[in-house]
Interface confidence: medium
């Protein structure tokens, strides 16, 4: 029969190096009689026999960590005791070695030029990995603006446009190398106007192109504002080249305006804008038409269809690029202005405006427009539309309405030929002749001008029955 023998550890534990997810084994060979009980500790804490992360075999002499984790490093001890003599212990360290691992990779960053950008790159590994950065295909060199921090993050002070590009961090130790995914650093630049629109002074009905050029990252959008509101008409052509946007607003000018080019780009939730403005003013419309060049043709438009004589030839002024279109738009604009006037004034004003804008025409060798007869013009101004005319002139005097006076193609009555001098030299307004049949009295009108300014319409043509100051019979 064997004699009792106190435990002796014949192979002391050694330091074990293990890679994460690999197997690590400690061997604790014990000689004793009777057979000892062997227990294991990690960092002085007992390892439980039923812990499935471990395998204890050979009567407790072999401890295997089945899949090493980085948290498994520490001091492992085996303790052997068989009741004979004292317990014996041997200890050894587990050093968990780890290939580099990037635990917080960099992410895509958008940053405004001039600010500071930080691209994170937090790593794990044993030995501790060194971190470097690649931009595009080349290793990134540190300088006064660009530094790799102790944490591995890349810091760029005062970001410049040329810093934009694709970056990745590289973590390296003796066991291997880890690369992050490529991330994009986008450098955003506030919108800036390179070329402001220019102001213009043009004739009514002409085309004007306002040009505005802006730069920024992302490429700005350009919008146009007319007198504080979005531009309602006109065509916009845009082109983009090398982050520069070129916007051209083509306008058909029917009224003066302040046109503002607004360049906007978005930075996250915020916007940056740049503005530049130009004025478009209208050169005076009612120039003498004696020197007008043009042609005689039938009226094909809509607005004056019911007013003009059906088969009459009217004068189209070729000082406009497209006379028919320009004159039609002008009358359309005037028509809208007339929506607010009284029922007495409106048809008379429509007749006046249509016949003034689309003057009767004698073809001849030189097409000649025939102006409205002065008497008819004055009848509209001083009789049918007296209140409206006064209000308009009052506003004009106060400078409130300057553009409106020029916009409405109203003739200057005093400059028109009188039908008393030469009845064939001017155009009558059939509408006013017709009214004599239907109107017996007009309301009393206080005129801003003496009645002598209004020559009588001849009885043969018209016999208005009006207040005494305007007796035209």
């Amino acid at each position: 029969e064997k004699l009792p023998k106190a435990p002796v550890i014949t192979t002391p534990l050694e330091t074990v190096d293990a890679l994460v997810e690999e197997v690590a084994t400690f061997m604790c060979a014990v000689e004793s009689y009777p057979q000892p009980e062997i227990s294991w500790t990690r960092n002085k804490i007992l390892i439980k026999l039923f812990d499935t992360r471990y395998s204890i075999r050979e009567n407790g002499q072999l401890l295997t960590i089945l899949s090493v984790e980085d948290s498994d490093d520490g001091i492992y001890c085996c303790i052997a005791n068989n009741g004979v003599g004292g317990a014996v212990e041997s200890c050894g360290a587990l050093q968990v070695k780890m290939k580099p691992k990037i635990t917080r990779p960099p992410i895509n960053v958008k940053i405004i030029e001039g600010l500071k950008a930080v691209l994170p790159c937090t790593t794990m590994g044993n030995p501790k990995p060194s971190v470097s950065w690649i931009k595009g295909d080349n290793a990134l060199r540190e300088n006064s603006r660009i530094a790799v921090l102790e944490s591995g993050s890349l810091r760029i002070h005062n970001v410049q446009k040329e810093d934009a590009g694709q970056y990745r961090c590289v973590a390296k130790n003796s066991l291997g190398t880890a690369y992050s995914k490529l991330v994009k650093l986008e450098v955003e630049v506030f919108a800036r106007i390179l070329r402001a629109p220019e102001s213009h002074n043009v004739t009514f009905g002409s085309f004007v192109t306002l040009r505005c050029t802006a730069i920024g990252i992302p490429v700005p959008t350009i919008s146009w504002i007319e007198n504080g509101n979005a531009v309602s008409s006109g065509s916009i052509q845009e082109s983009v080249k090398d982050r520069v946007i070129d916007s051209r607003l083509q306008l058909f000018i029917t009224k003066p305006g302040l046109y503002t080019c607004i360049a906007t780009n978005k930075h996250g939730e915020k916007f940056s804008t740049a503005k530049a403005a130009a004025t478009v003013s209208i050169a005076e419309w009612s120039k003498s038409q004696k020197d007008s060049q043009g042609y005689c043709a039938q009226y094909r438009g809509e607005v004056c269809d019911a007013v003009l004589a059906k088969d009459a030839l009217v004068f189209f002024n070729t000082s406009y690029r497209d006379p028919e279109d320009a004159q039609e738009l002008l009358i359309h604009t005037a028509w809208n202005e007339l929506k607010a006037v009284s029922p007495l004034c409106r048809p008379a004003a429509e007749a006046l405006l249509c016949n003034h804008l689309f003057q009767e025409c004698s073809p001849g060798v030189v097409p000649t427009p025939m102006p409205i007869c002065r008497e008819y013009c004055l009848a509209v101004k001083e009789l049918f539309c007296a209140k409206e005319w006064q209000a308009m002139e009052g506003k004009a005097h106060r400078g409130l309405y300057r553009s409106g006076m020029h916009l409405l193609p109203v003739p200057e009555c005093s400059k028109l030929p009188s039908m008393h001098r030469d009845p064939t030299a001017c155009t009558r307004l059939p509408y006013l002749d017709y009214k004599k049949e239907n109107i017996t009295t007009f309301p009393s009108i206080t005129s801003s001008r003496p009645s002598a300014d209004i020559p009588n319409l001849p009885a043969s043509t018209s016999s208005f029955a009006v207040s005494p100051a305007y007796s035209m019979t």
Partner: antibody, heavy 121, light 112 residues
Amino acid sequence: EVQLLESGGGLVQPGGSLRLSCAASGFTFSDYGMSWVRQAPGKGLEWVSAIPWQGGSTYYKESVKGRFTISRDNSKNTLYLQMNSLRAEDTAVYYCAKRSGRIAFGALDAWGQGTLVTVSS
Amino acid sequence: QTVVTQEPSFSVSPGGTVTLTCGLSSGSVTSSNYPDWYQQTPGQAPRTLIYSTDSRHSGVPDRFSGSILGNKAALTITGAQADDESDYYCGLYSYSGSKNYVFGGGTKLTVL
């Protein structure tokens, strides 16, 4: 680039209805008069209808008056032709055409590729 | 009813000059009819050549010109080329009781 794209054509029985649409792009639609022109197989061009820029007036060929209705939606850049009480003689390729200016009777300066309307029992 | 008349067919030698005309069955064509000219090749949509008597549409070669000759509108092609072989239509604005736009029957031009 001015583009006019007609749709809505097809086969319809006599007395039936069709609505043609014309989607316009590449120009400020609301600044131009528009027209429909048709061409019967192997025949010449025939003006059908016209509408000015604002759509206030409409004009029709005598033979389609009361049956066809031209309209426009400037907010959608679209021209329409509602055709009712269709007859065999309305069979044709229908072209949408842009006028050169605001008025309804300016020159036709841009044309779509056409949509075929066949009226047959 | 307004009827617009055109020569049904016409032929021209390459490099030659041809004048196609457009008349009204009743009366003369004047600038008030705003004559327009269109070219159409088989299977294609028409193409605008001349508008309002003599204005050339953008992109149209200056070989094409429009005018009023006597009591008719005219389209003249100088230095005719093979690809000028097409149908040519004139369009007239007319006002006879109501506004109207009328096409001629078209002229088939052959470049021999």
